[in-house]
């Protein structure tokens, strides 16, 4: 029967007793930077080309016995998971292996850098189709390794890496912390985060998604027909590399941003038990398990968005946090979140010719996060309209006044340390959906975009009694672009998007009291692109 | 890649040359920074990646590496250029004493220097 991991990544419409993906990734080349491999294993023989690249440190210990099967173990298994005939994800993908890890599975940042440079030079000498680079390794945070990954990604290469097996914040490791890399955590057959001895999968905002990574059957270097189960975030990353190869084979023109958005979009949502993660990391960790798209074509009509969390600002009074979208993405909205509730909101601002989302800490606050909603919106022209604090009882409001521009997100930012909770709640006048409304002491920022066929609507969900969490979701066919709270009072910890749902978090009910001041409204801006839908119909 | 770097592996004699002058001193106010792994057991002191500014050409990378060797030799230190980077990042990989870091950070075109560190199969 089909191994659990292949079943898990297969959409229901393909599920049978066997794993039969629609396309095997045959147009894609996957580079593997790992240990040496047993290239004559029946799973991968003829599919994996061993390059002459080798840059590894000597093994530790004077009595180390170099046994070929042990030296090849990690890399052979991963090559099998990516493209193995029996147990591979992308059975049609061809691979090239570079040896950057020694027989003990240890390498160096410098060796990995030279390996990445080798790939870039190979790409320049002999351009082929789409390239995926699998980095099933991790070291401490490295500015230079992250920089090299960024350069390679900007040269059109898709990099997939292991989040790390340290049961820790993936942002503390490289290349897991590189924003341009697709970073993968590991889950098991029960869709739970993988525990590995006393440690386990890494987590946090630097993880893009999770994938099967426990008890994964694959080629064993013990013998040319042997199979073995292995576990780790490397195995998880290999699944995503395989899925990426298949998606790129079906749509070779996909950019890294488009591929990442699709990987997120087609993932299984909210299946991971977040209690496994440290409490402060739960909100930052994506609850996504990778899966193949139900059909390899026709996804182009959708408006894809993802949520990007910033690093924590730190607790100093004037501390700020910045969340950025990828170069090919549009920042459609910006929100902020603080566990203590002490924040001074957020604003969208231009930085290096691109909009970023900046959140502001408040005096006595433990720090804030900026949360960017990053979307794929071709031919978009977006700008930010700002209204300074109104000081009028009606509150501050701003709208998109340019012809053809629609509201995609609202942000509010205030200079005062504390927005009083005694102010009456501000309600948006009906019939004015293209308008952001906020507290009278706050400046309000509207994200206004023009793109062919783009239409947006505002959806609200208000709860009169205080609740720790208020949510509002966009319906089928619409994509959440903006998420904010009404009113911007101090008991609101912040707002953020989780998939297609806008979440507004408030202080613990017990500390708020049940007066009308506790009323919270979650405001979602839901958009869709008729232009993308038409374009996709024309293609079909 | 060793052949490629063979030219730089010999000890450079401490001869005064235009290479060793201050003709290309770093621009005022831009100080190169040093980075190392926060996890101590994973550090590999003695090997450093010298990253040069983005638009630096290969010939400038080679020249900067030679200059470092020359200046180190004059101070009695042996250095070995293990690799010259180009294609992704401009720079070079050097085996040298940590005592030379201050000197290396002052070289022209240097953006930052990172001490090598270990990575592990996951």
């Amino acid at each position: 029967s089909i191994p659990w991991n292949l079943e898990r990544i297969t959409p229901p419409r393909y599920r049978a007793d066997e794993y039969q993906p629609p396309d095997g990734g045959s147009l894609v080349e996957v580079y593997l930077l790992d240990t040496s491999i047993q290239s004559d294993h029946r799973e991968i023989e003829g599919r994996v080309m061993v390059t002459d690249f080798e840059n590894v440190p000597e093994e530790d210990g004077t009595r180390f016995h170099r046994q070929a099967s042990k030296c090849d173990s990690h890399g052979t298994h991963l090559a099998g998971v990516v493209s193995g005939r029996d147990a591979g994800v992308a059975k049609g993908a061809s691979m090239r292996s570079l040896r950057v890890l020694n027989c003990q599975g240890k390498g160096t940042v410098s060796g990995t850098l030279i390996g990445l440079e080798f790939i870039r030079k190979s790409q320049l000498v002999q351009p082929v189709g789409p390239l995926v680079v699998l980095l099933p390794l991790a070291g401490g945070y490295s500015r230079v390794l992250n920089a090299a990954c960024q350069r390679l990604a900007r040269a059109g290469v898709v990099l997939v890496t292991a989040a790390g097996n340290f049961r820790d914040d993936a942002c503390l490791y490289s290349p897991a912390s590189a924003p341009e890399v697709i970073t993968v955590g590991a889950t098991n057959a029960q869709d739970q985060p993988v525990t590995l001895g006393t440690l386990g999968t890494n987590f946090g905002r630097c993880v893009d998604l999770f994938a099967p990574g426990e008890d994964i059957i694959g080629a064993s270097s013990d013998c040319s027909t042997c199979f073995v189960s292995q576990s780790g975030t490397s195995q998880a990353a290999a699944h995503v590399a395989g899925i990426a190869a298949m998606m790129l084979s079906a749509e070779p023109e996909l950019t890294l941003a488009e591929l990442r958005q699709r990987l997120i979009h087609f993932s299984a949502k909210d299946v991971i038990n977040e209690a496994w993660f440290p409490e402060d990391q739960r909100v930052l960790t994506p609850n996504l398990v990778a899966a193949l798209p139900p059909s390899t074509h026709g996804a182009g009509w959708q408006l894809f968005c993802r949520t990007v969390w910033s690093a924590h600002s730190g607790p100093t009074r004037m501390a700020t946090a910045v969340a950025r979208c990828a170069p090919d993405e549009e920042l459609l909205s910006c929100s902020s979140f603080s566990r203590s509730g002490k924040r001074r909101g957020e604003r969208m601002e231009a930085q290096g010719g691109k909009l970023v989302c900046r959140a502001h800490n408040a005096f006595g606050g433990e720090g804030v996060y900026a949360i960017a909603r990053c979307c794929l919106l071709p031919q978009a022209n977006c700008s930010v309209h700002t209204a300074p604090p109104a000081e009028a009882s009606m509150g501050t409001r701003v709208h998109c006044h340019q012809q053809g521009h629609v509201l995609t997100g609202c942000s509010s930012h205030w200079e005062v340390e504390d927005l009083g909770t005694h102010k009456p709640p501000v309600l948006r006048p009906r019939g004015q959906p293209n308008q952001c409304v906020g507290h009278r002491e706050a400046s309000i920022h509207a994200s206004c975009c023009h793109a062919p066929g783009l239409e947006c609507k505002v959806k609200e969900h208000g709860i009169p009694a205080p609740q720790e969490q208020v949510t509002v979701a966009c319906e089928e066919g619409w994509t959440l672009t903006g998420c904010s709270a009404l009113p911007g009072t101090s008991h609101v910890l912040g707002a953020y998007a989780v998939d297609n749902t806008c979440v507004v978090r408030s202080r613990d009910v017990s500390t708020t009291g049940s007066t009308s001041e506790g009323a919270v409204t979650a405001v979602a801006i839901c958009c869709r692109s008729r232009h993308l839908a038409q374009a996709s119909q024309e293609l079909q | 890649q060793e052949d490629e770097d063979g030219d730089y592996e010999e000890l450079v004699l401490a001869l005064r040359s235009e290479e060793d002058g201050l003709a290309e001193a770093p621009e005022h106010g831009t100080t190169a920074t040093f980075h190392r792994c926060a996890k101590d057991p994973w550090r590999l002191p003695g090997t450093y990646v010298v990253v040069l500014k983005e638009e630096t050409h290969l010939s400038q990378s080679e020249r900067t590496a030679r200059r470092l060797q020359a200046q180190a030799a004059r101070r009695g230190y042996l250095t070995k250029i293990l690799h010259v980077f180009h294609g992704l990042l401009p720079g070079f990989l050097v085996k040298m004493s940590g005592d030379l870091l201050e000197l290396a950070l002052k070289l022209p075109h240097v953006d930052y220097i990172e001490e090598d560190s270990s990575v592990f199969a996951q």
Epitope: Q20, E45, R47, R85, I217, C226, F227 | -
Partner: antibody, heavy 119, light 113 residues
């Protein structure tokens, strides 16, 4: 149900060519390896070689390398064993067998094709 | 190539009695990563294709009566029929599947005494 159906018995003269077939049904033919096994009259089993129909990758026993060709047509879920020039010593029963998942041992066998080579 | 040698070549056992067949491989077929022996046993009755009985040296294939059992590790293996039945008359083959070329033992013929 899962089965392998082989082509019928063949009587051939030495020097002639021959191609026998093995059609799989009831499962995803491209995802399982097919081996060919020879059994000469009154003798034991000899593994000849294997094919993965998904990409037509083959691996032959050194004893049979160059003597026979194994191929597959995944569009009709059929594997083949062929000879370009038969010898009298090729007289035998030939079985195709499907791999068990993740191990080259054989859970499903064809009924066998008897090949007789005689002048 | 791994050479598989079976003993005895033939065996006559009374109905209800135990039959034991041995198989030796020229090199170990036990692998450390999953601690499994890559050895199988097949039964072939006259005029029929072989049938898989045991794999991983000791795992019974579904539908195989529990009077058939496999044991051994490394290079020495045994197939035991605990209580021979009339329908067990056949030739039994061991097979290693740890590496190409796959090899079979020469076969052991089991008859009723």
């Amino acid at each position: 149900q899962v089965q392998l159906v082989q082509s019928g018995a063949e009587v051939k003269k030495p020097g002639e060519s021959l191609k026998i077939s093995c059609k799989g049904s009831g499962y995803s033919f491209t995802n399982y390896w097919i081996s060919w096994v020879r059994q000469m009259p009154g003798k034991g089993l000899e593994w000849m070689g294997i094919i993965y129909p998904g990409d037509s990758y083959t691996n032959y026993s050194p004893s049979f390398q160059g003597q026979v060709t194994i191929s597959a047509d995944k569009s009709i879920s059929t594997a083949y064993l062929q000879w370009s020039s038969l010898k009298a010593s090729d007289t035998a029963m030939y079985y195709c067998a499907r791999d068990y998942a993740y191990k080259p041992l054989f859970d499903i066998w064809g009924q066998g094709t008897l090949v007789t080579v005689s002048s | 190539d791994i050479v598989m040698t079976q003993s005895p070549d033939s065996l006559a056992v009374s109905l209800g009695e135990r039959a034991t067949i041995n198989c030796r491989s020229s090199q170990s077929v036990l692998y450390s990563s999953n601690n499994k022996n890559y050895l199988a046993w097949y039964q072939q009755k006259p005029g029929q294709p072989p049938k898989l009985l045991i794999y991983w040296a000791s795992t019974r294939e579904s539908g195989v009566p529990d009077r058939f059992s496999g044991s051994g590790s490394g290079t020495d293996f045994t197939l035991t029929i605990s209580s021979l039945q009339a329908e067990d008359v056949a030739v039994y083959y061991c097979q290693q599947y740890s590496s190409f070329p796959i090899t079979f033992g020469q076969g052991t013929k089991v008859e009723i005494k």
